[in-house]
């Protein structure tokens, strides 16, 4: 018997043990977060699977993820949303210390999918562990990209109060209009609920004392946000290591000086 032809994509295949990983993460998350104890993880997995299984992996839509979004509905208290762009690790380190602030990956759906890849095949119930579409080389409407677009949009839409965003000051484009933050989240903050966006620009070099809040891309972000009737603030974080240390120990005498 000849092996059935399988579509070859340019990206890496589905993460090994993907179903088990999603289910295990869901169980762990709902055990740790009392407000999500009502979540039925089998239903969550069924909804996740239903979004991409048997579907052509370059034709996934936001509609496909609506059951999963509904089952994973969660709210963040006002002033506690932390967005990030190109600086995920530091953002996550921060929310691990500052437990009352939340990135998307601290929410159930973001937690389930963080660092995972997945895709299926048209008209079969199989998961493709060999290859999945690459955003640039194959298509943008792939299961992973559409998932993050969907949940990022919802995360931004439900944010309220003062929203914070952590940006990477070491990159040539500190604010990148093509990032998820720049293309999705910025445009889905709701002016009637969000009073301000405060950007934290994280410096890379120890001796870097420039005011990166004056960077042209930050001015572009300020313009976009202001046009949406949301106030904009910007802070330089010159010493990210000290910044985290001071979040952990705000009483430390060295934290009274600038970070």
């Amino acid at each position: 018997v000849l092996p059935r032809w399988r579509q070859q994509w340019s990206g890496s295949g589905t993460t090994s043990r993907f179903p088990e990983t999603v289910l295990a993460r869901c169980v762990k998350y709902t055990e740790v977060h009392p407000e999500m104890r009502h979540v039925d993880c089998q239903s969550v997995w069924d909804a996740f699977k239903g979004a991409f299984i048997s579907k052509y992996p370059c034709n996934i839509t936001e509609e496909d993820y609506q059951p999963l979004v509904k089952l994973g509905t969660q709210t963040v208290p006002c002033n506690k949303t932390l967005l990030w762009s190109r600086i995920k690790d530091l953002a996550h380190q921060f929310t691990q210390v500052q437990r009352d602030m939340f990135t998307l990956e601290d929410m159930l759906l973001g937690y389930l999918a963080d660092d995972l890849t997945w895709c299926g095949e048209f008209n079969t119930f199989e998961i493709n562990y060999q290859s999945c579409p690459d955003w640039r080389k194959d298509c943008s409407n792939n299961p992973v990209s559409v998932f993050w677009k969907t949940v990022s949009r919802r995360f931004a839409e439900t944010a309220c109060g003062v929203v914070h965003v952590m940006l990477n000051g070491s990159r040539s484009k500190i604010f990148d209009k093509n990032s998820t933050f720049g293309s999705v989240e910025v445009h889905n903050l709701q002016p009637e609920k969000v009073q301000a966006l405060e950007a934290w620009v994280i410096h890379g070099g120890r001796e870097d004392s420039r005011d990166l809040c004056q960077d042209p891309t930050i001015k572009e972000l300020e313009s976009i946000i202001s046009k949406r009737n949301i106030r904009f603030f910007c802070k330089n974080i010159y010493r990210p290591d000290k910044f985290l240390q001071c979040v952990k120990n705000p009483e430390d005498s060295s934290c009274l000086s600038g970070i």
Epitope: H38, V39, D40, Q42, S43, D46, A47, K49, G50, A51, E62, E63, D64, Q66, P67, V69, K70, L71, T73, T75, T150, R153, R154, E157, T158
Partner: antibody
Framework: EVQLLESGGGLVQPGGSLRLSCPAS????????MTWVRQAPGKGLEWVST????????WYADSVRGRFTISRDNSKNTLYLQMNSLRAEDTAVYYC???????????????WGQGTTVTV | QSALTQPPSASGTPGQRVTISCSGS????????VSWYQQLPGTAPKLLIY???QRPSGVPDRFSGSKSGTSASLAISGLQSEDEADYYC????????????FGGGTKLTVL
């Protein structure tokens, strides 16, 4: 044959309670979300409540939240709607409908009962 | 006041093509699948279209659905007298607490 058959409607005083039942037959009941929809006399359809296939999660319209409770017994293939603190504006024909399957092949209400009338 | 807006009435003569619109917003139609229902006088609703464009088996191909942005449409070609009914669009709502939303319904009269 796939069938839904609502019962439990009737005449009730404002502030009273009723429990609607909807036994299902002809399909794997435990594999589908289920929904209640109502229609006031001469009016359009109004979504009331939806429950997932396992019964683990439910949603309610603002107009009934806190007063109505949707539930299901998969061992009896039956959907329920417990209606408390009934008001005149709850007067309607109540339909139960088969909703999204847990394969998520579609989101729609593809099988409907004949309806049961509730008069407050 | 329905979250989805439909014209209250529409009409056509036998054989004609009629289109019923359903207008919503980014919090419902734009990111969710739309379904359409037919309700003949004195009967329960019946599913006509699901997932924006799909027809359940048994529904004639005279009925077709489409969606663009925050609006959806139901088209009925080769109108027949038995098509006289109320037609409703529905979709998932993105609010935190709700699920389905319906249009107000369109009464189709075959002249």
């Amino acid at each position: 044959e796939v069938q839904l058959l609502e019962s439990g409607g009737g005449l009730v005083q404002p502030g009273g309670s009723l429990r609607l039942s909807c036994p299902a037959s002809g399909f794997d009941f435990s594999s589908y979300w289920m929904t209640w929809v109502r229609q006031a006399p001469g009016k359009g359809l109004e979504w009331v409540s939806t429950i997932t296939d396992s019964g683990g999660r439910a949603w309610y319209a603002d107009s009934v939240r806190g007063r109505f409770t949707i539930s299901r017994d998969n061992s009896k293939n039956t959907l329920y709607l417990q209606m408390n603190s009934l008001r005149a504006e709850d007067t309607a024909v109540y339909y139960c409908a088969r909703d999204t399957p847990k394969t998520y092949y579609y989101y729609a209400m593809d099988v409907w009962g004949q309806g049961t009338t509730v008069t407050v | 006041q329905s979250a989805l807006t439909q014209p209250p009435s529409a009409s056509g003569t036998p054989g004609q093509r009629v289109t019923i619109s359903c207008s919503g917003s980014s919090s419902n139609i734009q990111y969710s699948y739309v379904s359409w229902y037919q309700q003949l006088p004195g009967t329960a609703p019946k599913l006509l279209i699901y997932n924006n464009v799909q027809r359940p088996s048994g529904v004639p191909d005279r009925f077709s659905g489409s969606k663009s942005g925050t609006s959806a449409s139901l088209a009925i070609s080769g109108l027949q007298s038995e098509d006289e009914a109320d037609y409703y669009c529905a979709t998932w709502d993105e609010s935190l607490l709700g699920l389905w939303v319906f249009g107000g319904g369109t009464k189709l009269t075959v002249l």
